[in-house]
């Protein structure tokens, strides 16, 4: 499925756990149309069926085109006096959306990545907070549930916890995005 | 309010090492990285290199690699960089900056010291 | 490495005119790009992060736009204050890279 859009290791530290981060604008800051692929260069797709998206994570045969996925970019206030793990100020938050109307939320009943269709205001399932990483690659964490990250388990998109004291440096959940 | 003080000039022989201090204020030291960019007299800017304040992790441009170490000490909300072997060409004024996302480093640096002229000459 | 290259190098300009610096990145990449100013003797100043989002205390004559691999910084209506060197800066991957500076001067 074609995008229909027209249009390392980490920085810091981790979202406060109980934080309550307020998004300082309703329109992003700046957006990109970017496909998206694992830390070993699998690459994520998505297709319809059954009149609902499905996510795969895959090795693509050379010929075939990456489907894109629009990334909004807000910015994201943290009061210092909410910052219980020692992170408090302005933080880079993401929402993917892969075709028109539909963005990808975090469903932490399930430890789950959806698909789902909705309108603006987006909840807050859809949004993530973006770590930057070395060799260049990202980590989406969960702005629901901090320490919970986007990742790959059994070549399906999942929801990982990452401990406080770890490093972050697991390499399912990092992902490299490219605008090419 | 934030603020980023840098430690004073240096005056280095060749072949010696020199570590610059910048010590942060009004805000949460952990929560930032810090990048060290310096500026040789009359040119422009350069990039030398980035270190997490929340885990020490860090990354270097390939120039200074082995040359370089950047580290910082939380109890102190100090960051620190020591460049080793130095040349005549390293005569320049180093300053330490804020990155302005505490977990990105896409939006460019907020904050700056006040530049620390490190001065190489035999 | 992204090289970021800007022109012109200097410009000479008299209070009230419209300036405008360009930046031109030799891979494209979206909008992580910000845009300096650095005073003789002084420690560089944020003025837009993001191509075009103006960073909070600078004033709304500075204005930037661009993405991919042309950017722009302009200088509404130049005042005395801002005779500096302007520099971009891209964002996007590391190596993170400046570009060589722009010399705004009084004609």
């Known amino acids: 499925m074609g995008s229909s859009h027209h249009h390392h290791h980490h920085s810091s530290g981790l979202v406060p756990r109980g934080s309550h981060m307020s998004i300082t604008g309703i329109s992003p800051i700046t957006e990109s149309l970017a496909s998206l692929s694992t830390y070993n260069d699998q690459s994520i797709t998505f297709a319809l069926e059954d009149e609902s998206y499905e996510i795969y994570v895959e090795d693509l045969k050379k010929d075939k085109k990456k489907d894109k996925v629009l990334l909004s970019y807000y910015e994201s206030q943290h009061p210092s006096s909410e910052s219980g793990d020692g992170v408090d100020g302005k933080m880079l938050m993401v929402t993917l959306s892969p075709t028109k109307d539909f963005w990808l939320q975090a469903n932490n009943k399930e430890h789950s990545v959806e698909l789902h269709k909705c309108e603006k205001p987006l909840p807050d399932q859809a949004f993530f907070v973006l770590h930057n990483r070395s060799f260049n690659c990202v980590s989406f964490e969960c702005k629901t549930d901090p320490g919970v990250f986007i990742g790959v388990k059994d070549n399906h998109l999942a929801l990982i916890k990452v401990d406080y004291s770890e490093n972050l440096g697991s390499e399912n959940i990092l992902f490299k995005l490219s605008e090419t | 309010q934030v603020q980023l003080v840098q430690s004073g000039a240096e005056v280095k022989k060749p072949g010696a090492s020199v570590k610059v201090s910048c010590k942060a204020s009004g805000y949460t030291f952990n929560s930032y990285g810090i990048s060290w960019v310096r500026q040789a007299p009359g040119q422009g800017l350069e990039w030398m290199g980035w270190?997490?304040?929340?885990?020490?992790?860090?990354h270097y441009v390939q120039k200074f690699q082995g040359r370089v170490s950047m580290t910082t000490d939380t109890s102190t909300s100090t960051a620190y960089m020591e460049l080793r072997s130095l040349r005549s060409d390293d005569t320049a004024v180093y300053y330490c900056?804020?990155?302005?996302?505490?977990?990105?480093?896409?939006?460019?640096?907020?904050?700056w010291g006040q530049g620390t002229l490190v001065t190489v000459s035999s | 490495d992204i090289q970021m290259t800007q022109s012109p190098s200097s410009v000479s300009a008299s209070v009230g005119d419209r300036v405008t610096i360009t930046c031109r990145a030799s891979q494209g990449f979206s909008s992580w790009l910000a845009w300096y100013q650095q005073k003789p003797g002084k420690a560089p100043q944020l003025l837009i992060y993001?191509?075009?989002s103006l960073q909070s205390g600078v004033p709304s004559r500075f204005s930037g736009s661009g993405s991919g691999s042309d950017f722009t910084l302009t200088i509404s209506s130049l005042q005395p204050e801002d005779f500096a060197t302007y520099y971009c800066q891209q964002a996007n991957s590391f190596p993170l890279t400046f570009g060589g500076g722009t010399k705004v001067e009084i004609k």
């Open positions: 900056a804020r990155h302005s996302y505490t977990t990105s480093w896409y939006g460019g640096f907020d904050y």
């Open positions: 270190i997490s304040s929340h885990n020490g992790n860090s």
């Open positions: 993001a191509a075009s």
